[in-house]
Structures are given as C-alpha cells and as structure tokens.
C-alpha cells in the first residue's frame, strides 16, 4: 500500500494492516530464582516478573510458568540479558595444578518449545569462559535477535547455574520479545 | 484491520495506523566527552553527536543536552553500546596484597528521567567487574529492550566512569530509540 | 492516520503505509568459514548460511556472497552475535618477558558498502581485549543498532580472526537486519 | 519441593577422617550452588565452603586445607570430606543450598564429634 | 575476612512487641545481608535476603533495613512462634560469614 490513495470505488482486499499498538510486547524482569527440577540434558528456566515495575505483558503475549507464550505468528525481535555474579573461579588453581583445565563458564540460552516439536529449539546462545583473577566477578550476557515463530510457541530463558543469576535490579536481568 | 478489504460504505473508526517512516527514531554516536557536574549518587551522562556521520533523529525525536526527548507515548526499542578502555586493573595486586577485594567495575546505565517524578529511573544496567591481567584493556557493554515510554520522557546513558570511555569512533559507542 | 477514519468521500493521498509481514528481513547463521582473500586493511568478511534452520531471506532482501543486500532504502536494525573460542592468550607471558604488551584482541564490524562509495563504511564495531587466564577461553561479541541505508546498500560482517570463530551452532554466531 | 539430607555423622577420634554426605532432592546439582555450615555446641554457625552449580569449588581459609567438597550428579548427593580432625570441629554439620549471596533452604543437620 | 557484629546477644520480649535487632559488618557490604530463624531441631530457615527482601512464605511483620555496614531486622509484632535463635550473614564476599546470633526469648 505504500505511497497508495485509499479511494472508495474499489473493494480490493489489501495485505493485512495492523496498529502498531495492538501488536504482542512483552518485557520481563528478574526475580530471585529458586531450586526447581529440570529436564535431563537441559540448562534450568528462569522465572520472571511479568507486571511490577518496568515489566509487562500486553496485546494477547502472555506469561505463564516461565514461558512466554506467542499469541500470533510472525517474525519476533527477542532479547535477554542475564547477569551473572560469583565468586573466584577456581580456574588459575587448577591450571596451576596440571590438572585437566576446561574452564568454567556461564551460559544462557533462548529456547523456543512447540508443542508438536518433541526438542526444544536453541534459538540464542551466549556463552562465556569466566577464569577471573578477583575474589568478586559480575558480568552480563546480552542476546537478541529476530525469528519467525508459530502461534502456540512458548520462549524461556535457560541459564546454566540458576544460583549464580544477579537477581537484585530488575535492569540487570531481563527477557523480551515484541512482533515486529 | 489484519486481513480485512477497506470498504466505501462504513465509516468505522479503525485502530490507529501509521506510516512507519514518520515514527520518532534516534541514533547518535559517541564524541569526546568533558568533565561536568553530575548529580550526587548518580554516574555521569554522557554528551553525544546527533547529526554528523551515522548519527541522526528524525521525526520529532530530539537530542538536547545529554537527552533525547521522547515526543509521542508508545513502546520503544532502546539500545546502547559503550565501549571502555583502560589500563591495568590494581585488582591482582590488592588481592595479592590481602586488602579488601572489591573489584573495579564498568557500568552502563540508561535512565529515564519523566519531569513529574523525582527519581530518574534505570531501565537498563549493564555492569561487569575488570580484573584484567594485561597492561591495556578494552570492551563494550551492550544494551537494549523495549520500554513503554511517555511523551516528554528523556533518556540518557550513564557511566561510571566518564574517562574510561572511547570516544575514538563512532561504531564503537552509541545510543538509539525507535518507536515501534 | 493515526486514529482516523476511512471515509469514502476523499481521495487524499496519505502517508505510506505497508504491511509489516512485507518488509524486508533476514537472519543468518553460522557456517564452518573457509579461509578467503579480502581486501588489504579489512578484516575478513564472514559468509552465512541464510536458507536452513533458523535462517530465513525474505520480502527481497537477499544474501549473496557474504553481503545481505538492501531492497529497499529506509531505516533498519542490524545486529549480529559472534562467538569466539581460542586457546592461551601469550598475553601474560609477554607481560612478564617485558616486551610490549599489546594485548591479543578480538574484534566485530558491521559494515555497509554502497557502489557508488569507495571506502566501506563501518557501522557497528565490537572489541575486546583477551588476556585469559584459562587455557581455553570462549566469548560472544554482541552488536545491534539501527541505521539508513540505501536500496542497493551491501552489509556485511568482518572479524578480525576468522580461524577463532566458533562455528559449530547456529545460536552463537549470527547475522540479520530487518526493516523497521 | 527442595530437600536436603545430611548424613554419615558419628564419633570419630582426633585426627581421623570423616565423609558426610548431603542427599538433595527438588533440583539439579549441576545447576545450583550447596553450601556447608557448621555450628559448635552453644556458638554460631561457621560457613566452611561451597559447590557452585557449575562445579567449582570455595573454600573458607580458616579450615587449612582439610575439608574437600565434592559431588556425585548421579545420586545427586554433595559430600563434605574431612580429613585430620580436631577436637574444636565437633559440630553439628549442615548443608544448604541457594543463591550466590544467601542459603535459602537448609537441612536438619548431623552431628560430628570428635573425641578420643 | 569480614566481621559481622550481632546485638544484642540476647532480648526478652512479650507476644504483639515490636523487637528490633542490628548487625554491623567491618565493611561494605552492598547490601548483600541476609537474616536466619534457628529453632530447636528444626532446619535453618531464610527470613530475609539482600537487607530487605522476604523470603517466600515469610510474614509480612518480618522487615529488613540498612545499608553499608549497618543493617537492622525487626519484627512488627511478636508472635509465639518467633521466640527462636536469629544470625545474620553477609553475602558479599568470601567467606561467607555470620554474627553471632541473638536469642529471643519470652519475658
């Protein structure tokens, strides 16, 4: 329809239009995570805050149980960030040692699960060596990017230690997801 | 209106729809930044390039003072990236010494402040301890989500420390909005 | 039009509008890279995979020899992630053979060429010191902006070491842009 | 539901060693940090060290290298090793498990003395 | 290491007082500070987290406070099951270390 006079004589069925305003947003915020069981072979969900403060949910995206569920198909812009916190990594001494020297790390994964899929679907990976010299690390690992989802996908956020997430601000941690 | 002709007949009033190249949009880069005044317990803002080069705004979106000023309510894209440059971190050395091990730390922060409410607000905090082992160092920290935002609402971007950062090109410190 | 009506009598003719399902988008994923020529003073450019898995071309933007190439001109998001891995950094040694410490480093650029522009220009750069303590050592770069481009405008994605590119999944190196 | 079981307490002589053992249930091991704590006959508790979700190890410098921390996924138990012990490390010995600044959930406790 | 600074070490009180107790660390601790109940033979249980956050399942009278080195637990309103063995612990820094405690017992 670009640049295209909207005249009243003719009945032609237009691509789909939409306000941009009724589209599916969400923006999630961290909360303290707690111990929970989860699948074999697959890093642990975290949960969110999805109404206080800076976090929201509107136009049919909803959140429930740690994932966020897409209402309509189409192509999403989705992102995370995760901020991780620990202590000394034991990483100098045990290269010190001799001993085998795989790193320790800290991972977070965006992963998409459809019903009719049996996997889930890796769709964002960030994954770090942390080998810190200081007694105290922090960092964060920021993804985003766009993907074509079905109505009926459900996205959460994996990480690979859940007690190791900075849960204190919620500008530290957060998930989103909008249809563009 | 998704799938829905334009019939003559009725004069419904739709949805608002609106053409995408007339929505406010930012971009600006990074410059040389001076020492000023900050308020107390909050990090510096930066200052930054609004129309040389990559840097624009268009479409009622302006940059004054430190702050890009949202013209229209509505959800939001914001993003960042700045990237920081240094010299050797003491960190090893205090650790070595026994003296207490708080690490140094690059922080990012991008804050709203709205006029009728005293306290800015962070939307964003990238933060991460450096500890590093080689005499110069350097990295960014990545930003962006997407916020529900007020007209008059102002952005800006916050560092913890002003003189850390590179100011040398404008592909490696930046800062956006776009109205989705 | 926001929050006007369509009524039949006029034949204005108003702001473009489009169908956001027609705009032009891609998002590209890793492949095991070859090494190849590039030009002098240019880091190497990355090439893609842009049909299987999670990566898509669609609405004429399409990917041809390492380039998306620009169907249309307008303001789009470009972002990309890669993930590198490498061993050792000699960085410490260096340091402590007291020769001069420029430390190893690992560099992103987002690039836009336009034909009828001799030098390429870079749009997003993302770099970082490496100087690790591990014998092994992996992190992911993140970039993300937007920008005017050009129909006919080429992107593309140039790192500064193609051999530390960690290739071997399609969520940890990744490429896209999408009109906004 | 998160639980943690301590067990392998008992007697044991001035300078021999000990294994207990933390069996948890309601998470992953390799996802979650379990701590150890101590806390002597009528005085505080003592932190002795931590198994990070991703394997790594800390230590409270105090204990001189004597307590090791380990763990089995298998059976998703943690263990605490303790090796040439002392009078002063009888203690009712804890595991928990939580964040990576607080312990949110604990188990009851088993006893340790040493005496000859 | 970080000291952590308990008072008092013991308190008497009634059912509906109000009951304040502090823990003072011999440095920052960014908030990090964290306040357990200990009772008879029962495990450990997590009131508060990062000063001033309840644990789930925790009543609202429970209330965290401080900054710094200073920090304070209160409880709004006693009720019988408080009487029991309280520590704070600071989260910031290795070693994780405790105050002492503070007893509360039925005046």
């Known amino acids: 329809l670009k640049g295209q006079e909207f005249a009243p004589s003719h009945q032609q069925v237009y691509a789909p239009l939409r306000a941009d305003g009724d589209k599916p947003r969400a923006h999630l915020t961290v909360v303290r995570q707690t111990p929970t069981q989860h699948f074999k072979n697959q890093f642990p969900a975290l949960h969110w805050e999805h109404e206080l403060g800076l976090a929201f949910t509107k136009n049919r995206m909803n959140y429930t149980n740690k994932f966020l569920l897409i209402p309509e198909s189409g192509d999403y812009f989705i992102y995370s960030q995760v901020t991780f916190r620990g202590m000394t990594s034991e990483c100098s001494e045990i290269r010190q040692a001799g001993r085998p020297n795989k790193p320790d790390s800290i991972t977070v994964v965006i992963t998409k699960v459809t019903d009719s899929y049996p996997e889930p679907t890796q769709l964002l990976m960030g994954t770090k060596s942390v080998c810190e010299v200081g007694s105290n690390w922090f960092q964060p690992i920021y993804l985003g990017a766009m993907f074509s989802l079905q109505e009926g996908d459900k996205l959460m956020v994996n990480v690979s230690d859940i007690s190791l997430v900075d849960y204190t601000k919620e500008d530290k941690t957060f998930f989103g997801a909008f249809l563009l | 209106l998704k799938g829905q002709e334009f019939a003559p007949s009725h004069q419904q009033v739709y949805a608002p729809l609106r053409a995408d190249g007339d929505k406010p949009r930012a971009h600006l880069t990074v410059v040389r930044q001076t020492p000023t005044q900050h308020f107390k317990n909050q990090f510096p803002a930066l200052h930054w390039e609004h129309e040389l080069g990559l840097a624009f705004t268009k479409n009622r979106m302006n940059y004054t003072n430190k702050f890009l000023l949202i013209p229209e309510s509505g959800d939001y894209f914001i993003y960042s990236q700045v990237t920081f440059r240094g010299m050797t971190s003491e960190c090893s050395e205090i650790r070595q010494a026994g003296r207490p091990n708080k690490p140094d730390s690059i922080t990012v922060v991008i804050t709203k402040v709205t006029d009728s409410y005293p306290e800015p607000t962070q939307l964003l905090m990238g933060t991460k301890s450096v500890c590093e082992v080689g005499s110069n160092w350097f990295q960014p920290i990545y930003l962006g989500a997407m916020f529900s935002l007020q007209e008059g609402d102002k952005l800006m971007v916050n560092v913890s420390d002003i003189s850390l950062v590179d100011y040398t090109k404008e592909d490696k410190t930046f800062f956006g909005a776009f109205l989705l | 039009l926001k929050g006007q009506e369509f009524a039949p009598s006029h034949q204005q003719v108003y702001a473009p509008l489009r169908a956001d399902g027609d705009k032009p988008r891609a998002h590209l994923t890793v492949v095991r890279q070859t090494p190849t020529q590039h030009f002098k003073n240019q880091f190497p450019a990355l090439h893609w995979e842009h049909e299987l898995g999670l990566a898509f071309t669609k609405n004429r933007m399409n990917y041809t020899n390492k380039f998306l190439l620009i169907p249309e001109s307008g303001d789009y998001f470009i972002y990309s992630q890669v993930t590198f891995r490498g061993m050792t950094s000699e960085c410490s040694e260096i340091r402590q053979a007291g020769r001069p410490n420029k430390p190893d480093s690992i560099t992103v650029v987002i690039t836009k060429v336009t034909d009828s522009y001799p030098e390429p220009t870079q749009l997003l750069m993302g770099t970082k010191s490496v100087c690790e303590v591990g014998s092994n050592w992996f992190q992911p770069i993140y970039l993300g902006a937007m920008f005017s481009l050009q129909e006919g405008d080429k992107l593309m994605v140039n790192v500064s070491d193609i051999s530390l590119v960690d290739y071997t999944k399609e969520d940890k190196t990744f490429f896209g842009a999408f009109l906004l | 539901e998160v639980q943690l079981l301590e067990s392998g307490g008992g007697l044991v002589q001035p300078g021999g060693s000990l294994r207990l053992s933390c069996a948890v249930s309601g998470f992953s091991l390799s996802s979650y940090g379990v701590d150890w704590v101590r806390q002597a006959p009528g005085k505080g508790l003592e932190w002795l060290g931590v198994?990070?979700?991703?394997?790594?190890?800390n230590y409270n410098s105090a204990l001189k290298s004597r307590f090791t921390i380990s763990r089995d996924n298998s059976k998703n138990t943690v263990y605490l090793q303790m090796n040439s012990l002392r009078a002063e490390d009888t203690a009712v010995y804890y595991c928990?498990?939580?964040?990576?600044?607080?312990?949110?959930?604990w188990g009851q406790g088993t006893l340790v003395t040493v005496s000859s | 290491d970080i000291q952590m600074t308990q008072s008092p070490s013991s308190l008497s009180a009634s059912v509906g007082d109000r009951v304040t107790i502090t823990c003072r660390a011999s440095q920052d601790i960014s908030n990090y500070l964290n306040w357990y109940q200990q009772k008879p033979g029962k495990a450990v249980k997590l009131l508060i987290y990062?000063?001033?956050r309840l644990h789930s399942g925790v009543p609202s009278r429970f209330s965290g406070s401080g900054s710094g080195t200073d920090y304070t637990l209160t409880i709004s309103s006693l009720q019988p099951e408080d009487f029991a063995t309280y520590f704070c612990?600071?989260?910031?820094?290795?070693?994780?270390?405790f105050g002492q405690g503070t007893k509360l017992e039925i005046k």
């Open positions: 928990a498990s939580g964040n990576f600044d607080a312990m949110d959930y």
């Open positions: 612990q600071q989260g910031n820094t290795l070693p994780f270390t």
């Open positions: 198994i990070w979700g991703f394997g790594g190890t």
């Open positions: 990062y000063t001033s």
